[in-house]
Interface confidence: low
């Protein structure tokens, strides 16, 4: 019949000794087991393993000579007048000539004054920005309109209101050089035009800064 | 009335000069740009360049670069062209035209003087 | 520069015809074509602005159309005044540039 396994280790076990002391007396049982001993020191480093894949593309970076804290000079001017008070309806408010540095910048222009309009019928006036004799295409016309209705007409009397207003915008696409930068007063399509005013009693600017892409 | 009203025209040898005047009335220059629009006979119509009499700056069309000159004195609400180095096919009507409130739009045109430049 | 293509360079037409005249712009200009008449010995004269508005004292029957490229000048009932050369031009961008014209003669 067949030795229970442990039965066989301890038969094993008990041979050893035997074998092991031959002539002397044997072997208690095992103490407990000691303590982990220290760390040893480390091993020999392995061989490098095989390359890694390509990581992502990372992002576009720039050439630190073109950064904008490296080479960006501001570049900016304004034009400004004490009393416009400029009563045409049709026709250009007041320019201002800028330097443009480079062909790939966006200008920002800004104009800042009194605008009124005053009519006893519907009317609409428009104020719009000109860079060297046209409008922005790049990539819209930069413009504020005012329109007013009275409504009553038989009330033979008109609001005049003059308050300070800004026409502001980017305008890309304009070429290196000198700008001729101004503002408009013109007409609104399909409105009849009305009284309109420009710059009464405060001061009025033109702000125009040269922006890069 | 706004009116434009040119002077200045007549025959010119090549390579030589000429100064044509555009007096306005009816409005100020200095409230509006100035063009100057050329048609030489039996074709269309061709731009030649402006001035903002306001400050001065002024634009060419790249076949008068260099050649011609826009001036305006406002105190006379006049703008001038200067033609130097005049060419056979400069030969034109040339108009002086008023953009006012639309958009580089010529509202107001003179009527014309008719420059020859032929030996 | 924007190039403007007219067409057709002339035509002839009666009293009281229906006129159409194209113009063709080389790049996009939005609405910003206008249309002008000129009469021989004479200055242009300023029909239509921002393609479809007609400027003061221009009689109703002329008309305009298109944006982008393509742009029309419509004359709705054509009178013996109207007899003439009509412009296209783009005030789009600097430098402002024509169409070599159309002629409109009497058949």
């Known amino acids: 019949s067949e030795i229970p396994k442990g039965k066989q280790k301890a038969q094993l076990r008990q041979r050893e000794v035997v074998d092991l002391y031959n002539g002397m007396c044997l072997q208690g049982p095992a103490g407990v087991p000691g303590r982990d001993g220290s760390p040893g020191a480390n091993g020999i480093p392995g061989t490098p393993g095989i390359p890694g894949r390509d990581g992502f593309k990372g992002e576009k970076g720039e050439c630190l000579r073109e950064s904008f804290e490296e080479s960006w000079t501001p570049n900016y001017k304004q034009c400004s007048w004490s009393s416009l008070n400029y009563g045409i309806d049709l026709g250009k408010i007041a320019e201002c000539t800028f330097t443009k540095m480079r062909s790939n910048s966006a200008l920002r222009v800004l104009f800042s004054g009194s605008l009124r309009l005053k009519c006893r019928n519907a009317c609409c006036q428009r104020w719009y920005f000109t860079f060297n004799g046209a409008e922005c295409s790049g990539p819209l016309p930069i413009e504020a309109i005012i329109y007013l209705d009275q409504g009553s007409p038989e009330m033979n009397s008109t609001i005049n209101i003059h308050r300070t207003s800004s026409v502001e915008g980017l305008c890309e696409g304009i070429g290196a050089g000198l700008v001729d930068v101004a503002i408009w007063v013109g007409t609104c399509s399909d409105y009849p035009k009305g009284d309109a005013s420009t710059g009464w009693n405060s001061v009025s600017r033109i702000i125009i800064e040269e922006l890069p892409k | 009335e706004v009116q434009l009203v040119e002077s200045g025209g007549g025959l010119v040898q090549p390579g030589g000069s000429l100064r044509l005047s555009c007096a306005a009335s009816?409005?100020?220059?200095?409230?509006?740009?100035i063009h100057w629009v050329r048609q030489a006979p039996g074709k269309g119509l061709e731009w030649v360049g402006r001035?903002?009499?306001?400050?001065?700056?002024?634009n060419y069309a790249d076949s008068v670069k260099g050649r011609f000159t826009i001036s305006a004195d406002t105190s006379k609400n006049t703008a001038y062209l200067q033609m130097n180095s005049l060419r056979a096919e400069d030969t034109a009507v040339y108009y002086c035209?008023?953009?006012?409130?639309?958009?580089?739009?010529?509202?107001?045109w003179g009527q014309g003087t008719l420059v020859t430049v032929s030996s | 520069d924007i190039q403007m293509t007219q067409s057709p360079s002339s035509l002839s037409a009666s009293v009281g015809d229906r006129v159409t005249i194209t113009c063709r712009a080389s790049?996009?200009?939005?609405?910003?074509v206008a249309w002008y008449q000129q009469k021989p010995g004479k200055a242009p004269k300023l029909l239509i602005y921002?393609?479809?508005f007609l400027y003061s004292g221009v009689p109703s029957r002329f008309s305009g159309s298109g944006s982008g490229t393509d742009f029309t000048l419509t004359i709705s009932s054509l009178q013996p005044e109207d007899f003439a050369t009509y412009y296209c031009?783009?005030?789009?961008?600097?430098?402002?540039?024509f169409g070599q014209g159309t002629k409109v003669e009497i058949k």
């Open positions: 921002s393609a479809s």
């Open positions: 001035i903002s009499p306001y400050g001065g700056n002024t």
């Open positions: 031009q783009q005030s789009y961008t600097t430098p402002p540039t």
């Open positions: 009816g409005f100020t220059i200095s409230g509006s740009d």
């Open positions: 790049q996009d200009v939005s609405t910003a």
């Open positions: 035209a008023r953009v006012g409130g639309l958009k580089l739009l010529f509202d107001y």
